[in-house]
């Protein structure tokens, strides 16, 4: 083993290095001292370090470590943050288009329904947005709400235009009849299935991306323990105390220290791997009715078909509803 | 037969959006994201090594510091922790993760469970017998996964989706991100971190 180079007789070099860390020289001894009060950089002989310097080194070592960790995760963090923003905005755009398509369908095919239909369609797609962003809305309730609201307007405007406006009593009766008589056939159920499946997947996809950001942020801002700070100090700075300014830590030694400091963080590894693989599986399955883009942009067509279905059965329906809601209608016509 | 939202169709049976065809769809963007994420699959296990490679470590020097003394780079003492009496490295590992790390692990377990639940086989998506009682409904054909319309005439097979990402106000390509490669070790760059903190080579 080669003999260590003789320590700087005056600690001059150590002082000039330490000055960068801590302006003001009072902590650095003029000449090497026994260093019996040192707790981390235990000297084998005279040392140019004091207890105060040691504390400053520990602080700096932990700061170094935090910066290294942040720079290590920068690219990953950027990747997830940017994609979460892109997808959130893209999903909002999909919802906006879907709403516009549906409104256009009403305007082109059923102009007499438009003012109210626009309102109900708007509320439905607002609910869709809220759901995607994590609000606790039941998709079946959203779809029922849309059809419950639409049917009275369809009945009074398309099927039975003689009814007076603001027929509140009949509207309530019609809302009830809508479900009891299944006036839209199975279209509401079809829409519920498609919308709930596609939105669930979309929502979990966004949730997963946001959790990814949270994971990186958590590990990015970890505060390292005192023990870790001591190990890092010993590795990066204790050589200075002996005047060995240009010496670097041994590679294997660095790995051992890092494994120790990061033992907790590395425990995330198993779950992180699983997270990426599970997310891949989810993404691979996001097609057809599991793809909100596909489902929402086709909704106008399904809603149109559901109204056609009502019109096709108008004769049968009008008779049944005439009997069912007779009481309400009499009150209206009086 | 119905009017459809004007400027949206070339062919009534296929939803073709009259936007400029961009190469990127949401699904291609999703797949691209997954591919990039997969390059980070070992991120946490590789972290100790990554940090060592990005901090000053003896690479070409004959001598290196082992925490106590100057040793030859390939000697046994180089890898040994030169501070065994001060506190036990094993003890440090035994302490277990910080509470915040435990919390985030719990959240990861939860989302992984949800992701797995959502990623079940996709074959049997819609009930084939959607039409129960009530006024009869049009049939959707065999592949109800794709049945976006409902009754024969108005049924539309939704072909390729809108190319939305063109509309996004910004194009966030991760290739332009700072510090692009996880594997690369730009030795000159990381020195500045240490210079700022007073560490000099």
């Amino acid at each position: 083993q080669p003999p260590p180079p003789p320590p700087d007789a005056t600690c001059h070099q150590v002082r000039s290095f330490f000055q960068r860390l801590q302006p003001g020289l009072k902590w650095v001894p003029e000449t090497p001292v026994p260093g019996s009060d040192l707790q981390v950089c235990l000297p084998k002989g005279p040392t140019c370090c004091s207890r105060k310097m040691e504390e400053k080194y520990q602080l700096t070592a932990r700061l170094n470590m935090e910066q290294l960790l942040q720079s290590a995760s920068m690219e990953l963090k950027f990747l997830i943050i940017q994609n979460a923003a892109v997808f959130q905005e893209a999903f909002e755009i999909v919802v906006r288009h879907a709403k516009n398509y549906t409104n256009a369908m009403f305007k082109n095919n059923y102009p007499s329904l438009t003012p109210q239909a626009f309102e109900f369609v708007g509320e439905f797609f607002t609910d869709v947005s809220l759901y995607i962003l994590g609000s606790d809305i039941n998709v079946d309730d959203m779809v029922n709400e849309l059809f419950d609201s639409l049917f009275p307007v369809i009945y009074t405007q398309l099927m039975n235009p003689g009814l007076p406006d603001s027929a509140l009593d009949i509207n309530e009766c019609l809302r009830g009849a809508r479900r009891d008589l299944k006036v839209f056939g199975n279209f509401p159920k079809l829409i519920m299935t498609q919308v709930s499946k596609s939105l669930q997947v979309t929502r979990i996809f966004l949730q997963a991306l946001n959790l990814g950001i949270e994971v990186i942020n958590t590990t990015d801002h970890l505060k390292f323990s005192k023990d870790c700070g001591r190990m890092l100090t010993r590795m990066w700075y204790c050589s200075y105390c002996q005047g060995l300014m240009m010496v670097k830590p041994c590679g294997g030694y660095c790995n051992v220290v890092m494994q120790g400091c990061m033992a907790g963080v590395v425990e995330i590894d198993k779950y992180w791997r699983e997270y990426i693989l599970s997310l891949e599986e989810l993404v691979n399955g996001m097609y057809r009715i599991y793809d909100m883009e596909n489902v929402l942009l086709g909704l106008f067509s399904t809603i149109h078909d559901s109204i056609q279905y009502v019109q096709k059965n108008a004769g049968k329906l009008t008779t049944t509803i005439g009997k069912l809601c007779a009481h309400s209608q009499q009150r209206q016509y009086r | 037969s119905a009017y459809y939202p004007e400027d949206l169709f070339i062919d009534k049976k296929v939803l073709k959006v009259a936007h400029v065809e961009h190469e990127e769809t949401l699904s291609s963007r999703r797949r691209e994201l997954i591919q990039k994420l997969k390059s980070f699959i070992s991120f946490y296990s590789a972290l100790p090594g990554y940090i060592c490679s990005h901090s000053p470590v003896a690479e070409n020097d004959t001598l290196c510091w082992n925490g106590q003394e100057l040793v030859e780079r390939y000697s046994q003492k180089a890898a040994r922790n030169g501070m065994k009496n001060q506190f036990n490295l094993h003890e440090l590992k035994m302490k277990g993760p910080e509470p915040v790390v435990s919390q985030i692990i719990d959240k990861l377990k939860h989302i992984n469970q949800l992701l797995r639940t959502m990623s079940m086989p996709k074959g049997r998506v819609l009930d084939k017998n959607l039409d129960e009682e009530g006024f009869e409904s049009g049939d959707c054909g065999d592949d109800e996964d794709e049945c976006i319309g409902g009754s024969g005439d108005g049924m539309i097979k939704v072909k390729n989706q809108l190319r939305f990402l063109a509309e996004l106000a910004y194009d966030l390509d991760v290739d332009d991100a700072p510090g692009n490669s996880q594997q690369a070790t730009p030795k000159d760059n990381e020195i500045s971190t240490f210079h700022n903190l007073g560490n000099v080579h």
Epitope: E123, T126, D127, L130, L133, G134, S135, D136, I137, N138, D140, D141, M142, N144, E145, D148, E172, C173, R175, G176, R179 | -
Partner: antibody, heavy 121, light 111 residues
Framework: QVQLQESGGGLVQPGRSLRLSCAAS????????MHWVRQAPGKGLEWVSA????????YYADSVKGRFTISRDNSKNTLYLQMNSLRAEDTAVYYC??????????????WGQGTLVTVSS | QSALTQPPSASGSPGQSVTISCTGT?????????VSWYQQYPGKAPKLLIY???LRPSGVPDRFSGSKSGTSASLAITGLQAEDGADYYC??????????FGGGTKVTVLG
Amino acid sequence: QVQLQESGGGLVQPGRSLRLSCAASGFTFSSYAMHWVRQAPGKGLEWVSAISSSGGSTYYADSVKGRFTISRDNSKNTLYLQMNSLRAEDTAVYYCAKDRRGSHADAFDVWGQGTLVTVSS
Amino acid sequence: QSALTQPPSASGSPGQSVTISCTGTSSDVGHKFPVSWYQQYPGKAPKLLIYKNLLRPSGVPDRFSGSKSGTSASLAITGLQAEDGADYYCQSYDSSLRVVFGGGTKVTVLG
């Protein structure tokens, strides 16, 4: 005639339980979200809880979360509020209110007359 | 969840106008969520006056009007009448779909 009628209020000791009911008539009950709103003597309105049309989603104010449970029986056109671990600060007139919409809170277009709950030892 | 902010009182003479403000945050009123207004007489149940920021249910006089901008909403009563003396509450909801009320404004018709 659209109507809501609350019942079940009264004097109760702190820590005890009470169940409020609200009978609905004159509208398609199963088609609308429903709410409980309370008003302490001389104070403003405070929203307590909501339930969507199917009962599939429920919402609570922070002040009652974990202690109160909202539920509905669409076949009986009735809304319920189960109040456990009652505190003095729960003393108020409790109103049952119908929402304009079915999926979640929006605006309350029909209100009951209220039932007084007094929590005191 | 925090309440919306309303002035505690407002007053005006018959025939005059009164405006009541209601200030929320970016997570309720400012988050595209609509505002509703209620009128309440002492000892009575509240009554819906305005919903979706500006719409009036049938039966509500057009002297009452609502508006919304950013995180604030307001209720205007023009041509004030004696029977308009009451408490007025604004209401919205947040992204958790929990309802928030304002603290209430007591309107006094002078003279």
